[in-house]
């Protein structure tokens, strides 16, 4: 399939102009190569009419231009003074010959329609309302008023002042006068449908003294807006149907021959093919809404339509907006795993690609939720604190310059199964969707920490060991201390007299962490993990409680926070060993000014990131960089 895309079907009227936009993949070669517009000729040859090299055929002399917009990866062909001779089959394309990459375009130029004298032309979109104005003289002020539609030679009454309404206009047509006006009546026709188009005659009075007005009604199908998107990227359909449908259910559907199949609506319907990768977001009280689809697939290409109706389904005579989506398979977005599998108690490391040109952008990870129209609350981000319920088991590792960041989630439970999105505050195309599937564990985890009930005593030495299997022998082992802004790898042995140290006993495949001497702020979550370069692997977590050993009082163990991962995976509560009012950050709302569907990460200001009262009784250390 050619990666060039444009309008399949262009229609205009004699004497008018058209502007045709063609899209091409965003590459350096494409930006600079020749662009052309040619017409399908005899023997299948496509003869150039205009090109970016400066060629202009004599048929187009003085009436056409071709402009390249490399920053948008588009070029535009403008043709003026159209004649019916221009009706035909064309191609817009790229390359040194006209056999290269191209897109077929049909151009239809119609005759200027001929109407009787004094015909008022009304042009309205499908689903909208037209108000036809009918003037009359004072002599017909008390006479019968009517509107009829021309069908051949006959004129069939649509509505009249005796309250007759043609059945096909029932509940759609009204005839009325405004205020004290004595020389004009109006007919409103609402919920316009294509078959309403045609010539109407309004009349006041009968016989030769009747006043007549001609009105031509044109009912327009929505012109689809073209959207050119890369495979695996995302697309947003912005739908603005007007205030008159603000309170009706909204939908987005995909055209399928004669029907339009609903993908999502505000009544809770959602096509399973879009599960985990779609969000519908109301924009304001005027009926504006947007639909975001991530992880675009080849089969997502096609014609889409948004609309509003109380049923949440497409309905003839209701306003719609249309798009044609083209999915370019020559994508710059790398192919990444769409399904990641884990087991209860285990961990997953999810690699999130982002635009390498935007390494300083803020990175986020959110959990797609199916309720209502779909939403994606942020769980962790480079400047967003970890959401409640994920403390000690979720961290984001940025790898600047690599074009990817890694999100690690451990102490997995089956409730973690679902869809997650990787996103940044930069290039919105680089959103990826991952489905996490968590199955019940059938064997012991690869990494095991001893002792499992970890309580360290202030001032003493505390060692904790992480046992790993031989398959991890060649990988780098590490311990890190989890905090709300990541998991900071602990320094090696020689990096400070009082620092935590890491050493590895290769013979018994153990990596140990020693705290010497233990301080109150050492309390918290620690992770043992393996990695190869910047590729993170398995992790396991342990909560280290710190207490003061007081003489003469019995030693009371704090609640074992590690039970959450081991014995009671579903349990969310942690008692005195972790402060319950852990600070969280609000995402800057400007990051997602057009993407309110991604929920903010917390309920407190970003400035409160570092935890206060470090070292207070029962408080968690606010260890931050």
């Amino acid at each position: 399939q050619s990666p060039i895309f444009g309008p399949q079907d262009v229609s205009s009227i004699e004497g008018n102009s058209v502007s045709i936009t063609c899209y091409y993949p965003d590459t350096s070669v494409n930006r600079h190569t020749r662009k052309y517009w040619c017409r399908q000729g005899a023997n299948g040859y496509c003869a150039t009419l205009i090109s970016s090299n400066g060629y202009l055929s004599k048929e187009y002399s003085g009436r056409a231009s071709l402009i390249n917009f490399p920053e948008n990866s588009t070029f535009v062909i403008n043709i003026a003074h159209l004649t019916q001779e221009d009706t035909g089959s064309y191609k817009c394309g790229l390359g040194t010959t006209n056999r290269g990459l191209f897109f077929d375009v049909s151009l239809e130029v119609s005759q200027v329609p001929e109407f009787p004298n004094d015909t008022h032309v009304y042009t309205k979109d499908i689903g909208r309302t037209v108000t036809i104005e009918c003037r009359f003289k004072e002599g017909n002020a008390h006479s019968k008023k009517s509107l009829c539609k021309k069908r051949g030679e006959a004129c069939e009454v649509v509505i009249d002042s005796t309250e007759y309404v043609d059945p096909s206009y029932k509940d759609r047509a009204i005839l009325f006068m405004k205020g004290t006006s004595r020389d004009i009546f109006y007919v409103n026709i609402s919920h316009l449908i294509p078959s309403d188009a045609g010539l109407y005659v309004c009349q006041a009075g009968e016989g030769p003294s009747a006043d007549k007005n001609n009105a031509d009604l044109q009912v327009l199908e929505p012109e689809p807006e073209l959207l050119y998107k890369d495979l695996r990227s995302s697309v947003t359909f912005e739908c603005d149907l007007g205030r008159e449908v603000a309170n009706d259910a909204k939908y987005l559907c995909r055209k399928n021959k004669e029907t339009c199949d609903v993908i999502i609506n505000t009544l809770g319907k959602r096509d399973p093919a879009f599960e985990g990768r779609i969000l519908l977001t109301p924009r304001d009280d005027n009926g504006r809404f947007s639909v975001l689809i991530t992880g675009l697939r080849k089969e997502d290409a096609g014609h889409y339509q948004c609309g509003a109706h109380s049923s949440g389904l497409p309905q003839e005579g209701w306003p719609v907006q249309a798009w044609q989506l083209f999915v370019n398979e020559e994508s710059t977005i790398p192919n990444s795993r769409s399904v990641v599998k884990g087991v209860t108690g285990g961990s997953v490391a999810i690699v999130c690609p982002y635009n390498p040109k935007e390494s300083s952008s803020l990175k986020y990870w959110c959990h797609w939720e199916a309720d209502e129209n779909g939403r994606c609350p942020v769980l962790v981000g480079t400047q967003a604190l970890v959401q409640e319920g994920y403390e000690g088991r979720l961290a984001l590792f940025d790898q600047p310059g690599s074009g990817a960041y890694t999100v690690i989630l451990n102490q997995l439970t089956t409730q973690d199964s679902g869809f997650y999105w990787c996103l940044t505050d930069g290039d919105s195309r680089w959103r990826t969707t991952i489905e996490l599937q968590v199955a019940e564990a059938t064997k012991k985890p690869d990494l095991e920490v001893t002792p499992q009930n970890a309580t360290a005593v202030i001032g003493e030495t505390f060692t904790i060991s992480c046992h790993y299997p031989c398959k991890f022998y060649s990988q780098e082992k590490y311990w890190c201390k989890w905090s709300n802004d990541g998991c900071h790898i602990l320094p090696s042995h020689d990096e400070g007299a009082r620092q935590s140290s890491v050493s590895c006993d290769q013979s018994s495949q153990i990596v140990s962490m020693t705290l010497n001497p233990v301080k109150k702020e050492d309390e918290g979550w620690y992770w043992c993990g393996v990695k190869e370069g910047q590729v993170y692997g398995e992790t396991t977590a342990i909560y280290v409680a710190v207490e003061e050993r007081t003489r003469g009082s019995p030693h009371i163990n704090p609640t074992d926070a590690n039970a959450r991962a081991k014995d009671a995976p579903e349990e969310e509560a942690m008692e005195s060993s972790v402060r319950e009012d852990e600070n969280k950050a609000n995402l800057d709302p400007r990051l997602f000014a057009d993407e309110r569907e991604i929920q903010n990460a917390g309920d407190q200001a970003q400035e409160n990131r570092a935890s206060g009262n470090a070292g207070s009784a029962g408080g968690q250390s606010g260890s931050s960089k």
Partner: nanobody, 119 residues
Framework: QVQLVESGGGLAQAGGSLTLSCAAS????????MGWYRQTPGNSREFVAR???????HYADSVTGRFTLSRTQDKNTVSLQMNSLKPDDTGVYYC?????????????WGQGTQVTVSS
């Protein structure tokens, strides 16, 4: 040179159906657009339907939803399926093929086939 041969005209009742066919021969490979026009009593020749080389079809408002234009894989034969016929559809139907020579548009016409719709 393009030759167009029409078939399928005849008499039909109002509400009934007919199918017209048009086969192109000669330099048919260069056909740009193919379709049908009609001449009804007392009127000039008017556009009915056409199909472009990218399979886009256009119809006159008066036949939209009732007539369907299709063509064969080799693109040399077009068929006009006419349903829900009305007396107003009575007339001579002409097949049209348009070729663009590289500098000018040439329209080729069939001989015409009579369609009569009785009420």
């Amino acid at each position: 040179q393009v030759q167009l041969v029409e078939s399928g005209g005849g008499l039909a009742q109002a509400g009934g159906s007919l199918t017209l066919s048009c086969a192109a021969s000669g330099t048919a490979a260069g056909i740009d657009v193919m379709g049908w026009y009609r001449q009804t009593p007392g009127n000039s020749r008017e556009f009915v339907a056409r199909i472009f080389s990218n399979d886009v079809t256009h119809y006159a408002d008066s036949v939209t939803g009732r007539f369907t234009l299709s063509r064969t894989q080799d693109k040399n034969t077009v068929s006009l399926q006419m349903n829900s016929l009305k007396p107003d559809d009575t007339g001579v139907y002409y097949c049209n093929a348009r070729i663009w020579t590289g500098s000018t548009t040439v329209d080729y016409w069939g001989q015409g086939t009579q369609v009569t719709v009785s009420s």
